[in-house]
Structure formats: C-alpha cells, structure tokens
C-alpha cells in the first residue's frame, strides 16, 4: 500500500475547507491512545433541520493510481442519547470526491462533487485500549476509480449527525 494522505500524520492543523465557515465542521484536538493530540473534525448540529455542512480536504495527488481507497475512522453519537432531537438528528454522513488537475482550487460547487457513498456506523470497529476501558472507532473503507486527472479532493457532507472524523487515510495498492 502507498499512502497518499494520512490525517493523523499531519503536523499542526489540517486546515481543510469547511462550508459554512461557522456553525458546521470544526477542527478540534483530542488525545489519542498515547496521550498525543490528534486533529479531528467534528460537527453536531442536531437541533436544526435541513443541515448541509461540507468539509473539503486539500488536493490529493493520485500518483498515477487508477483506483484509490479511502479509510475513514470516526465516532458517531447515537441520536437516542440526545434528548428530544429525533426528528432532526441523523446517524449518517456522505462522502464525495472531485477530480482536478488544479492543486489549488479555491471554490468547488457542491454539484461538481461525485458521491462515493453514504457512511453509517456499523459493526466494523477498531478496538483501542485506553487504560481501564476499550474505545471503539468505526472504520469504513471505500474505493474510487478509475481516476484520470492528476489528483482529487475529498468532501464530507453532514446532514445533521453528531460526528467526529478521527482519521482519514487515502492509499492505493501497488500492482
């Protein structure tokens, strides 16, 4: 495997593009299993209907790979644990991509992104042992291809969930 993006290995802030700029996705540090701060993106607008919060990564080179894999590790808060928000709270988010030769696209319209999948929490967990308790991170992997341009952007669309993106890794498999 060849890694093209690993959010956990980025030093300092990730600085991805959130839309809207306020009230949607927020970049937040949390502690990992080694008590090291890691950058996450979090959103939890479960009281307001019709949420449409976007988060866009920096440009990712494909390095000639025709098919890439996207591994997302995340925590999703159960709507049942949030009182009185059952009508507006969701438990999924959407994953998109946009191919581009331009590594500095300033503005990409929502309708230019191509949907990869709707992501939900399932039984695919990564076990993380921290002291006296076991944490469970949802892990989902999706693939995209064939790709033709020099690179691409990923985007995460929140539609009213309570979620923390803990890790985003993009990689391809060497032939």
């Amino acid at each position: 495997e060849v890694t093209l993006l690993d959010s956990r290995s980025v030093q300092g802030e990730l600085g991805w593009i959130a839309s809207p700029l306020e009230g949607g996705w927020e970049e937040v540090s949390i502690m990992d299993e080694k008590n090291t701060p890691i950058r996450t993106y979090q959103v939890c607008n479960v009281m307001e209907p019709s949420q449409n919060n976007w988060l866009r990564t920096d440009w990712i080179t494909r390095e000639g790979a025709q098919r890439v894999y996207i591994e997302i590790k995340f925590t999703l808060r159960d709507c049942n644990s949030l009182p009185g928000v059952m009508g507006t709270c969701k438990e999924t988010f959407n994953l998109y991509y946009y191919e581009s030769d331009n590594d500095k696209e300033r503005f990409i319209r929502e309708n230019q992104f191509v949907k990869i999948d709707t992501i939900a929490a399932d039984e695919s967990f990564t076990q993380v042992d921290i002291g006296d308790r076991i944490m469970k991170l949802n892990t989902e992997i999706r693939d995209v291809g064939p790709l033709s341009k020099k690179g691409f952007y990923l985007a995460f669309q929140d539609v009213g969930a309570c979620i923390a993106l803990v890790s985003v890794r993009v990689f391809y498999k060497k032939a």
């Epitope: 949390i30 299993e33 644990s81 803990v166």
Partner: nanobody, 119 residues
Framework: QVQLQESGGGLVQPGGSLRLSCAAS????????IYWVRQAPGKQRELVAA???????NYADSVKGRFTISTDDNKNTVYLQMNSLKSEDTAVYYC?????????????WGQGTQVTVSS
C-alpha cells in the same frame, strides 16, 4: 474531579425572566459542547439550547427568541437567559457538557435547578 453546578432557578410569574448559571470545575468548557436540557414532570428530557466551542448557538423551536445561551470563559460558566417565561417552561433544567474522545463520548451532567412558572 469534574463537576457541573447549576443555579438561578426559582419561582417566577408568566412573562418574567430568570438567568440560570452552570459553573464548571475540573475541566474547561472550551473543549465541549454545552447543552441546557430540561425535564418537565411526567415528560421526557428536552434539549433546549446548545453552544459549540466557537460560540455557535442553537435553540429548540419552543424557546427561540426567548432564551439565550452564552458562556463566560473567564469564569468557566455557561448561562441561560430566559425571558417571556411561560407555564410550559416549568421543569428541572440541567447543564450538560460533552465532547468526543477517541472512539467514545465524554458526558457530564449537573444536578439540575428547578424553574417554576406560575401566577
């Protein structure tokens, strides 16, 4: 030790105002979402107001335009200003601070403060 302590509840006439306070000790609010949640007698808990780490606020439809949530980071306190109170606002009001851990949720609750709106 993490603690949330609400205060400011009491008996008030319809149309009156109250300001609830929630003081935190053992942690700082800036890492958490802060919720005010209420529970009326015989009813389920209801999320009333929320504020994010960067100060973005949300309100339940039933209190929009009447209630205001705010924080004072220096005092590590969150407030709920309640104006134009109605009898249906009668409930125990709880302060809730929560945040994401790695693969888990950190969730703290206060003991609650009673608000009674009655003439």
């Amino acid at each position: 030790q993490v603690q949330l302590q609400e205060s400011g509840g009491g008996l008030v006439q319809p149309g009156g105002s109250l300001r609830l306070s929630c003081a935190a000790s053992g942690f700082t609010f800036s890492r958490y979402w802060i919720y005010w949640v209420r529970q009326a007698p015989g009813k389920q808990r209801e999320l009333v107001a929320a504020i994010t780490r960067n100060g973005v606020t949300n309100y339940a439809d039933s209190v929009k335009g009447r209630f205001t949530i705010s924080t004072d980071d220096n005092k590590n306190t969150v407030y709920l200003q309640m104006n134009s109170l109605k009898s249906e606002d009668t409930a125990v009001y709880y302060c809730n601070a929560w945040g994401f851990l790695l693969g888990d949720i950190e969730d703290y609750w206060g003991q609650g403060t009673q608000v009674t709106v009655s003439s």
